[in-house]
């Protein structure tokens, strides 16, 4: 139930987060499951634990295995498992499927490729980007924060994109790479002021306390490929990443679909283990392009509300 797959390449940094959460003040102990051997916390070790994080600096193939993290709460010890696989570097340019993160799609005038897992690392811009092992050069490619923007995308831009960055730990630098596929949807068309298909304006969405909930922000921007079109969620007028609630996350990247010939984007907001407090928040679905911005507001309500004191 509390298990997570992680993978990396030998001689690169790999950082893994414990699947169990807890207050920042809680101690987290890590163990190598096969031997029950404790992972040290001293940073002089190549593999060491740092609170919720397990760090391989750098990783070795022999590090592969299942790691147990135990969050020491005041009452119980809560256990999670990280299934780590470290692979040998490929001699050729082929990136095997098992090293690939989720595929993202782009279009002629709207493309963003996010660098997977980068938020776990202590890195500084710029990122380096490669396609099929070749460094990306030219004004069409712009490394912006944790993603790559490709201007005037062509079908030939489809392929496997690798981001490379440096993780810094106490003055020492370690390389990290991550690869994902990029597909291109090619279509000529026109651009419109954004039309939000879902949610409806001032929609009330019923959710069950303690369960997971998904909110989809879906908007169309015209026909064919779009330039600078985006959908995103805000909480109480704040970006999801700035709001600081780990249970509430946007789906990484934006899914593009073509509905009745229209170019549409959707962004799923995932709320894990819905809390009473979530009902107090204002959820804004924002759709924007060169024509302007449209906002639809959603609020959550408890399904079949009853007095929770029973």
């Amino acid at each position: 139930k509390f298990s997570k797959q992680s993978w990396g390449l030998e001689n690169e940094a790999l950082i893994v987060r414990c699947p169990r959460q807890g207050k920042p003040s809680y101690t987290v102990d890590w163990y190598y499951s096969q031997t029950n051997k404790s992972i040290p916390t001293q940073e002089r070790n190549r593999v060491f634990a740092s609170g919720q994080l397990l760090k391989f600096l750098p990783a070795a193939v022999a590090d592969s295995g299942i790691y147990t993290c135990i969050v020491r709460s005041p009452t119980f010890n809560r256990t999670g498992y990280a299934n780590v696989t470290i692979y040998k570097k490929q001699s050729d340019c082929n990136v095997p499927d098992y090293l690939m993160y989720s595929t993202v799609s782009g279009s002629e005038k709207n493309s963003k490729i996010y660098c997977p897992t980068i938020d776990l690392y202590n890195w500084t811009a710029p990122l380096e980007w490669f396609k099929n092992c070749q460094a990306l050069q030219g004004s069409r490619y712009r490394a912006h924060k944790s993603f790559l923007v490709i201007d005037n995308v062509m079908t030939e831009d489809a392929g496997d994109y690798t981001c490379k960055f440096i993780h810094n730990e106490n003055g020492a630098n370690y390389s990290v790479t991550a690869t994902r596929s990029f597909t291109v949807k090619d279509e000529q068309g026109f651009s419109l002021f954004p039309v939000i298909g879902a949610p409806a304006q001032n929609e009330i969405k019923e959710v069950e306390i303690g369960k997971n909930a998904n909110l989809t922000c879906s908007a169309c921007f015209g026909k064919g490929t779009q330039f600078l079109a985006a959908v995103l969620w805000q909480l109480n007028g704040t970006k999801i990443t700035d709001f600081g609630e780990p249970r509430i996350q946007q789906e990484e990247g934006q899914n593009q679909s073509f509905s009745n010939g229209l170019a549409c984007l959707d962004m799923v907001l995932r709320i894990a283990d819905v809390k009473e407090e979530d009902l107090l928040l204002q959820y804004d679905c924002l759709a924007l392009n060169l024509h302007g911005l449209r906002r639809h507001t959603v609020r959550l309500s408890r399904k079949n509300p009853i007095d929770h004191h029973s």
Partner: antibody
């Protein structure tokens, strides 16, 4: 919707035992630890202990350790609190309670309606 | 165990007045939770993690503090705020509650 429904009031004689039940619904029973808190008439709240329904593991307040037993039945999503060697000062309302988000221990967001246990000869 | 001391034991104020309830802890804790209890009812969570307002709780309730001293404030008392208020720590086992502060509305 989360509900914690407790068994009815009990009258017991000193030296006897009492077993109070708390049936949970509206969420995945094994995902959340359940706690027991008691309140003597006109007094404050006192934490007795907690049970992890997934494993059956328990943590008791040392004050009750010799006399309290918490168990669970996953098939009925019910936890039980048994207190033995009852004395008059055990007369109290007994509550089961649950945190909102288990891993964050963010206070008791859900409470049962309470079970009054009266110990009298 | 961590001992929680609430003061005052009783607070008698008029509607619209500001109520300040204190909770002093025998050793430092990271967070504090606050509950309201009315006669014949189960406690109700008001504030969690020191300052976060629980769902459905009016904004006139607020919490603050750190270390060994924590405060619950009711900015403008309403008649329905008459109740006993408890602080609780979840820093170490056994979990403990304060003895309560009774708020009376004149």
């Amino acid at each position: 919707q989360v509900q914690l429904v407790q068994s009815g009031a009990e009258v017991k004689k000193p030296g006897a035992s009492v077993k109070v039940s708390c049936k949970a619904s509206g969420y995945t029973f094994t995902d959340y630890e359940l706690h027991w808190v008691r309140q003597a008439p006109g007094q404050g709240l006192e934490w007795m202990g907690t049970i992890d329904p997934e494993t059956g593991d328990t943590v008791y307040n040392q004050k009750f350790k010799a006399r309290v037993t918490m168990t669970r039945d996953t098939s009925t999503s019910t936890v039980y609190m048994e207190l033995s060697s009852l004395r008059s000062e055990d007369t109290a309302v007994y509550y089961c309670a649950r945190a909102f988000y288990n891993d964050y221990d963010d206070g008791f967001a859900y409470w049962g309606q309470g079970t009054l246990v009266t110990v009298s000869s | 165990e961590i001992v929680m001391t609430q003061s005052p034991a009783t607070l008698s104020l008029s509607p619209g007045e500001r109520a300040t309830l204190s909770c002093s802890v025998s050793s430092s804790v990271s967070y504090m939770h606050w509950y309201q209890q009315k006669p014949g009812q189960a406690p109700r969570r008001l504030i969690y993690d020191t300052s976060k307002l629980a769902s459905g709780i009016p904004a006139r309730f607020s919490g603050s503090g750190s270390g060994t001293d924590y405060t619950l404030t009711i900015s403008s008392l309403e008649p329905e705020d008459a109740a006993v208020y408890y602080c609780q720590q979840w820093n170490s086992s056994p979990l403990t509650f304060g003895g309560g502060t009774k708020v009376e509305i004149k």
